[in-house]
Every structure is written in structure tokens, then in C-alpha cells.
């Protein structure tokens, strides 16, 4: 019996330009003797329904159709074909097939492959136009894929040192396209720093599938009204 | 072994048209987005267009738009790019080439046809 | 419309020494590809997704960069690798390939 083992859970996800492998594992009922079976891995795109050859390997013969597509002939024998595509773009993401042939037996399997990118994130203070003690402080969310993203505001005093998070005066624009298909967004918090205990800190939190953990952007509140602090960037996507 | 073949130079006058052609060997040219890519003498590289030839679908650089036209023949596994209303600024080597799946990235190119315009 | 800036124009070396050539973009992008091209000849692929050699090129070449800024670096030249280098973006907003000027680099 020939069977083909996938990701569990039928989707990988990869960060953008890494060296990605989608894994495909062979059971068999027998040593494998990797002259006389074939490897074969497609892609069907997202955007264009088109299935193409990513790689194939047969016996002696194996070829890349995807400029540094490569599956190890030596992790091959102990069953393990899967690819590697080093530098992955967004554009590749879709539905990669690997299909295994020990003839006279055939045996395929498929995986969804997601390319996320993860956000940088950076806090602005905007105080044109604003009146005596309102500030507006806008949190950059830029670099971003897929589309989707979630900022929320926090603040913690010295009374309640625990996050809460805030609902008013904040305002999300809409997700902007950039050129190279990525993703920009701009929220913004608005402030009255008079009615504001000193020493309050503020948290610009950004939530997106790239991210294992939120990423986090902070100010205090001082006498002299505020202090910005670097992004705290926890750990990205790997 | 994968190859871009291209059609012979070409001397042609200015008002004319011209259809040059991109012969691929070692590949089907349906699992691949075909590009056209030009080159002045003595500058530098500038992107005409692609083509993708499982359906049909063109994208064209605005300066190209309305002028350059891309097609292929894929029983014969062919490109072809039609330049019509030629000037002496389109003196140029021009070149096919091939991008992979998603990766946009120019992996084959063919050896270029040089087409000069002139009266 | 994005537009790439390669810098210098024109670069001069002797063999063994280390060059770097940079490709700017007026936006932002995620990745870059580069081409090298001698008189005469098509160009080659050279580096794929900025850090990726394309098949056989030699190591001593490699690719960086993010955002805005690219940069190929040569570690030792040599005088074969004496050619125009061409970076290359594509962008899908809207879909356009684009690429830099070049960078020609000539052994002394």
C-alpha cells in the first residue's frame, strides 16, 4: 500500500521570502528504491486557475520548473519528499499537489499554502490642528499580508495596572494597497491629556496572522504630556 | 533542455508594423507567463508586456498600451509580439522571456531580435 | 508607478577587491531580483528574491536589502564578472514590471 502524508490540517503558513519547505511524506510497505519511482509537485495558483509543474524527479532524472525548487534525493529513501522553494513570494501562494508514483502504485496529496507578511509598526504624535491638551497619536501598522489585520488601543494606570482596552476616540482608516501587493493601516487615538492621570502608558496593539504574539507599541503620559516609546516588537512569525 | 528561440533581425520603415516571434523548446509555454522586454542601443532594459498563454490574458507597460500586441500559438509552443506604428525610437534589441509560476522572476531569456527602424 | 535608482552608474574595480551596487525604489517593496548582462549577449538571471543565487553563480556574489533599499556585493572581483547588473521589481498595484537602469562594472 502507497499513501502520501500532508501538513496536518491541510495549510501551511510561511513568511514571506523564506526559504519555505512543504512537507510530503511517503508510506510504503517496502524500502523505497528511489531509481524506479517519480516525484511530481504542482501549484495551482489563487488568482488564475492553472495547475503547473513545480518539480519532478524520476530515477536519474529530476528537474526544477521553479528556479531553485529541490527535493533531497537522500531524504527521498527514508521517504520524506518534500520540497524546498527558497525565497517564496506572495504571489505563490495556492494549492501545492505532491504525487508519488511506485509503479504500478500511485498516491497524491495537497496542501494550501499561505505567504504572510508581518507588519512593522511605528507611533506617530499628531498635534496639527489639535486643541489645548488634545492629542491625537496614530499608531502605522505597514508591510502587511494577508489583508486582514486588528489594532486596538490599551492603557494601564498605576490604579489599574492591568490593560484595558479602549473603545472611544479611536479611529481605524481603511487598509490601503501598496504597489508590491502588501498592506498599510493607520489607526488613530485621540487623547485629552488634561482629563489623563500621569504616568498612564498607552498601547497601540497589533493582531495579524504573521504575528505569534501581538505587536506592541507604547507611550506614558507624563507631566510634560507625553513621552513615546520604541515599538516593542515581540516575536514574528518563523 | 529549455530555450527561447527568436525570430531573424528586421529592417523596417517607420509608419510600419512588425510581428516578431519566440519559439520555446524544452517546456510548455502554458505553464509559464511570457514576457517581451526591449532594449536601445546602448540603454538599458524596458518591460513591453506578458502574456499568459492558457487563456490569453495581457498586461501591457502604459507606454505600450494600444501598440504592442501579445499572442501565442500553443499548438506550435510560440509567442508573438505585433509593434505597429513603428518610429526610429523603437530601434531595439528586443526579448522573450519566461517567468514561473508566481515568482516573477525572469529564469529564461531568448537571444534577442534586433529591429531596426529606418527610411 | 514605482521607479528603481541604481547606483553608481558605473563602477570601476581591480580584481580581489569587494563592490557593492544598491537599487532604491520610491516605495517600498518586498523583494528584488537582479540580472547580469555583457555587450552582446541576453541577460542571465543572477540573483532571484534578494538573497537567492540563480543556478551557477558563483558564491562570492550575494544579495541583500529590504524595504527601499537592495544592494548586490561582490566579496573578491574577478574579471569575468565584469557586466551590467540590472535589479528588477514587480509590482501588482498596479501590475507592472519595472527595472533599474544598471550598474556597470568595469575591472581596472
Known amino acids: 500500500d502507497l499513501k502520501v502524508e500532508m501538513m496536518a490540517g491541510g495549510t501551511q503558513i510561511t513568511p514571506l521570502n523564506d526559504n519555505v519547505t512543504i512537507f510530503c511524506n511517503i508510506f510504503y510497505s517496502q524500502p523505497l528504491n528511489i531509481t524506479s519511482m517519480g516525484i511530481t509537485w504542482f501549484w495551482k495558483s489563487l488568482t488564475f486557475d492553472k495547475e503547473v509543474k513545480v518539480f519532478e524527479f524520476f530515477g536519474d532524472h529530476q528537474e526544477a520548473f521553479r528556479p531553485g525548487a529541490i527535493v533531497s534525493p537522500w531524504r527521498l529513501k527514508s521517504g520524506d519528499a518534500s520540497l524546498r522553494l527558497p525565497g517564496i513570494q506572495l504571489e505563490e501562494a495556492g494549492e501545492y499537489r505532491c504525487e508519488v508514483v511506485v509503479t504500478p502504485l500511485k498516491a497524491q496529496g495537497t496542501v494550501q499554502l499561505e505567504v504572510v507578511a508581518s507588519p512593522a509598526s511605528r507611533l506617530l504624535l499628531d498635534q496639527v490642528g489639535m486643541k489645548e491638551n488634545e492629542d491625537k497619536y496614530m499608531c502605522e501598522s505597514s508591510g502587511f499580508y494577508p489583508e486582514a489585520i486588528n489594532i486596538t488601543w490599551e492603557k494601564q494606570t498605576q490604579k489599574f495596572p492591568h490593560p484595558i482596552e479602549i473603545s472611544e476616540d479611536v479611529i481605524t482608516g481603511p487598509t490601503i494597497k501598496n504597489m508590491d501587493g502588501t498592506f498599510n493601516v493607520t489607526s488613530c487615538l485621540k487623547l485629552n491629556s488634561s482629563q489623563e492621570d500621569p504616568g498612564t502608558v498607552y498601547q497601540c496593539v497589533v493582531r495579524h496572522a504573521s504575528l505569534h504574539t501581538p505587536l506592541r507599541s507604547n507611550f506614558t503620559l507624563t507631566a510634560a504630556r507625553h513621552s513615546l516609546s520604541e515599538t516593542e516588537k515581540t516575536d514574528n512569525f518563523s | 533542455e529549455v530555450q527561447l528561440q527568436q525570430s531573424g533581425a528586421e529592417l523596417v520603415r517607420p509608419g510600419a508594423s512588425v510581428k516578431l516571434s519566440c519559439t520555446a523548446s524544452?517546456?510548455?509555454?502554458?505553464?509559464?507567463?511570457i514576457h517581451w522586454v526591449n532594449q536601445r542601443p546602448e540603454q538599458g532594459l524596458e518591460w513591453i508586456g506578458r502574456?499568459?498563454?492558457?487563456?490569453?490574458?495581457?498586461i501591457y507597460a502604459s507606454k505600450f498600451q494600444g501598440r504592442a500586441t501579445i499572442t501565442t500559438d500553443t499548438s506550435s509552443n510560440t509567442a508573438y509580439m505585433h509593434l505597429s506604428s513603428l518610429t526610429s525610437g523603437d530601434t531595439a534589441v528586443y526579448y522573450c522571456?519566461?517567468?514561473?509560476?508566481?515568482?516573477?522572476?525572469?529564469?529564461?531569456w531568448g537571444q534577442g531580435t534586433t529591429l531596426t527602424v529606418s527610411s | 508607478e514605482i521607479v528603481l535608482t541604481q547606483s553608481p552608474d558605473f563602477l570601476s574595480a581591480s580584481p580581489g577587491e569587494k563592490v557593492t551596487m544598491t537599487c532604491r525604489a520610491t516605495?517600498?517593496?518586498?523583494?528584488m531580483h537582479w540580472y547580469q548582462q555583457k555587450p552582446g549577449s541576453s541577460p542571465k538571471p543572477w540573483i532571484y528574491?534578494?538573497?537567492n543565487l540563480a543556478s551557477g553563480v558563483p558564491a562570492r556574489f550575494s544579495g541583500s536589502g529590504s524595504g527601499t533599499s537592495y544592494s548586490l556585493t561582490i566579496t573578491r572581483v574577478e574579471a569575468e564578472d565584469a557586466a551590467t547588473y540590472y535589479c528588477q521589481q514587480w509590482s501588482t498595484n498596479p501590475p507592472k514590471l519595472t527595472f533599474g537602469a544598471g550598474t556597470k562594472l568595469e575591472l581596472k
Open positions: 522571456a519566461r517567468t514561473y509560476g508566481g515568482t516573477n522572476y525572469f529564469d529564461y
Open positions: 528574491a534578494t538573497f
Open positions: 516605495s517600498s517593496l518586498y523583494s
Open positions: 502574456i499568459d498563454p492558457a487563456n490569453g490574458n495581457t
Open positions: 524544452g517546456f510548455n509555454i502554458k505553464n509559464t507567463f
